[in-house]
Amino acid sequence: KSSSEATNITPKHNMKAFLDELKAENIKKFLHNFTQIPHLAGTEQNFQLAKQIQSQWKEFGLDSVELTHYDVLLSYPNKTHPNYISIINEDGNEIFNTSLFEPPPAGYENVSDIVPPFSAFSPQGMPEGDLVYVNYARTEDFFKLERDMKINCSGKIVIARYGKVFRGNKVKNAQLAGATGVILYSDPDDYFAPGVKSYPDGWNLPGGGVQRGNILNLNGAGDPLTPGYPANEYAYRRGMAEAVGLPSIPVHPIGYYDAQKLLEKMGGSASPDSSWRGSLKVPYNVGPGFTGNFSTQKVKMHIHSTSEVTRIYNVIGTLRGAVEPDRYVILGGHRDSWVFGGIDPQSGAAVVHEIVRSFGMLKKEGWRPRRTILFASWDAEEFGLLGSTEWAEENSRLLQERGVAYINADSSIEGNYTLRVDCTPLMYSLVYNLTKELESPDEGFEGKSLYESWTKKSPSPEFSGMPRISKLGSGNDFEVFFQRLGIASGRARYTKNWETNKFSSYPLYHSVYETYELVEKFYDPMFKYHLTVAQVRGGMVFELANSVVLPFDCRDYAVVLRKYADKIYNISMKHPQEMKTYSVSFDSLFSAVKNFTEIASKFSERLRDFDKSNPILLRMMNDQLMFLERAFIDPLGLPDRPFYRHVIYAPSSHNKYAGESFPGIYDALFDIESKVDPSQAWGEVKRQISIATFTVQAAAETLSEVA
């Protein structure tokens, strides 16, 4: 199905023309332009950048480009009362203080408005007490501490290393454990790759570097004061006490030099095993408190940040579709950064900019896509996906009726090893087919396809000769579109070698050292990986907007549904006695999956054979494809997470970044052996199985012949 069938355009106006127009040199130029000063959400600098992007998108040829503003809760350090952590002696004197800011990188010493490291939305407070080291502060780490080691964190300040899971989950876990404060730090074991120098001589984290980030547990709510509704002029706002997802204890991030000073004196219990030890020259004792001579010393936090309602700005560009203007394909990525945003987000924003320019060139030559393409530069992603969520809340009725697909465009790179894709199963075939047509940028794969290098470097664990595609989790702007609204979504970026590089994110993530030079010197000097990501993201948008039949394959959903049903059944079967006692059966779910598989197969045959020249029939089939993702939405949402409504996928309750399949059943089964009322717990498992069964069956029926 040629894309050129869509709007009777001349053959040169096809995907190839669009892809050929994308230039690495332009992406490089745009990245440089976007990274010279900080663009923190809610600041004048970020408003000015929004206006610049609006102006340039208009110049590129989009039909309209609008700024949409919202007044949302943001969080900033107090400029005159800095945040820090002290070691205090028995007299209350501060004998060591953590740093007040990161040593600025060369060439940026005189840049103003670099926000010092802080944990966004931390409450104010000055807790004082003994320290407990809690490893990564994951659910399993607290289980180990509390259940196995009998260490009580109540009234203690906990120190946790960054990595493995979203920082908001760490804080939530610490709160539930009774901690009075949380210190987050970057251990070299997670953020310093062996054999690589620290920035500015390499891409590793220096000891004074610190990861900023929000510590919310929003569960998809958007602005904490206006859950479910846009934060506009007439919005009703909750009081701070009722705000969604705010932490209740002070939290502050530090680098590994400061962590060294806090951890080197730790006493109490030894670490349980090597998985709790990082690579600082400290014992990694768990505590509580300091050892021997230092046992009278305590740790004190001084947190003075404030949360305030602040105006944010999205940029929304429209390229109207020629045939189906009421069908929207969205390409969106955020613009706000913690500091310079060399990778996050501007490596993504620069790619979006070049994609818009290329589409604009085609439009200037008389071409239009079949469907409408919306381009978005989101604000306040770093503060909880606020810009995208508020816009989607404001436009939810349109989006749920007209939204075909959402392609996310945050950081284009987190490494330079191979491609990484997370998407709905509906897009698997689109991604495979597209990457087979693109050239690999990888050394040693000259003249080979991207599909080939990707498959070689990141093979699928299930299917030989195919690359790995992961589940969508959260922690980025696709969340509201996929998890709340059920719009087919995907994301792609270049990544590291997960086999050899065990660090969590890239080492300089959310630090002052995430600069243009970091990218240009160490990650992608030729901007060839950026160009490849532009081709993947842009190519997906092109196909989704321009192919006559939507490039979705519902059979791939059938395959994963079977895999997920097997997985959750196997988890449940760890409790065979209880399943028998409480009559827990997955038969209905497997039956629904079987029905889905059969109906999807028949639908695919009809899709292959129907008369594509019949516009009514074409629209009907395309609508069935578009609405399939929507059919997995439960309007009631998941238990205690009303804005996570997708029954097949949700962000893990233990790690927002990770996707979990059949999350309702998974959460009902989690740690079920420790529940005080097993009968009620297994009753909830049965309820969740029935919801999943109904949803899969209902989704299958949307693919049946309509009459």
Epitope: L100, P104, E109, Y257
Partner: antibody
């Protein structure tokens, strides 16, 4: 060229004050911890004070605690030592020194890799 | 009385090897704090000779080497030369003083 130049020394009476300055050039001053070290006539080197790059930490030798204050102005690439209640035993050559970068810890917990030529302070009635 | 103890003087003939010891305690060298060595000609700026126990800054000849064991450290100079005749200081951090400590200094004389 990396350089440290001290100034402000002189002859002063006991009990009076003096302010020493150290102008840094040839390196990114704002990213380094800085020390003051002195050498009394006929004696060895004695560490006086240190300040972290961001002034979050300042430490002093017991002999000067409560009388001397170390500070810095990162916008002027200058280190200071404010010396109050001076005593005869404070007579010395005062050196400023840059803290040494060495991987495992804040530089100001390490040695000193670049030194100035020194400025002489004489406390005498 | 310095916290770190060095011999007041050592001497050696040109071409010979000499060592200068630096003895501390469990709150400084013995607490795994690094030892650094300086060369100081009075009236000039001290010069860093060895950092982090055994590392040489660029420009320092490999005739100079450092080592550390337990609560002591030492500086070795091989192939003594006339220009080596000056004062040498060891330095470390002391956790009980929360301060940086120097040895009393060692005067090296090159005989000849």
């Amino acid at each position: 060229e990396v350089q440290l130049v001290e100034s402000g020394g002189g002859v002063v009476q006991p009990g009076r004050s003096l302010r020493l300055s150290c102008a840094a050039s040839g390196f990114t001053f704002i990213t380094y911890g800085m020390h003051w070290v002195r050498q009394a006539p006929g004696k060895g080197l004695e560490w006086v004070a240190v300040v972290s790059f961001d002034e979050s930490n300042k430490y002093y030798a017991d002999s000067v605690k409560g009388r001397f204050t170390i500070s810095r102005d990162n916008s002027k690439n200058t280190l200071y030592l404010q010396m109050n209640s001076l005593r005869a035993e404070d007579t010395a050559v005062y050196y400023c020194a840059r803290a040494l970068r060495d991987g495992n810890n804040w530089d100001y917990f390490n040695g000193m890799d670049v030194w100035g030529q020194g400025t002489t302070v004489t406390v005498s009635s | 009385q310095s916290v770190l103890t060095q011999p007041p003087s050592v001497s050696g003939a040109p071409g010979q090897r000499v060592t200068i010891s630096c003895t501390g305690s469990s709150s400084n060298i013995g607490a795994d704090y690094d030892v650094h060595w300086y060369q100081h000609l009075p009236g000039t700026a001290p010069k860093l000779l060895i950092y982090g126990n055994s590392n040489r800054p660029s420009g320092v000849p490999d005739r100079f080497s450092g080592s550390k064991s337990g609560t002591s450290a030492s500086l070795a100079i091989t192939g003594l030369q006339a220009e080596d005749e000056t004062d040498y200081y060891c330095q470390s951090y002391d956790s009980s003083l929360s301060g940086w400590v120097f040895g009393g200094g060692t005067k090296l004389t090159v005989l000849g």
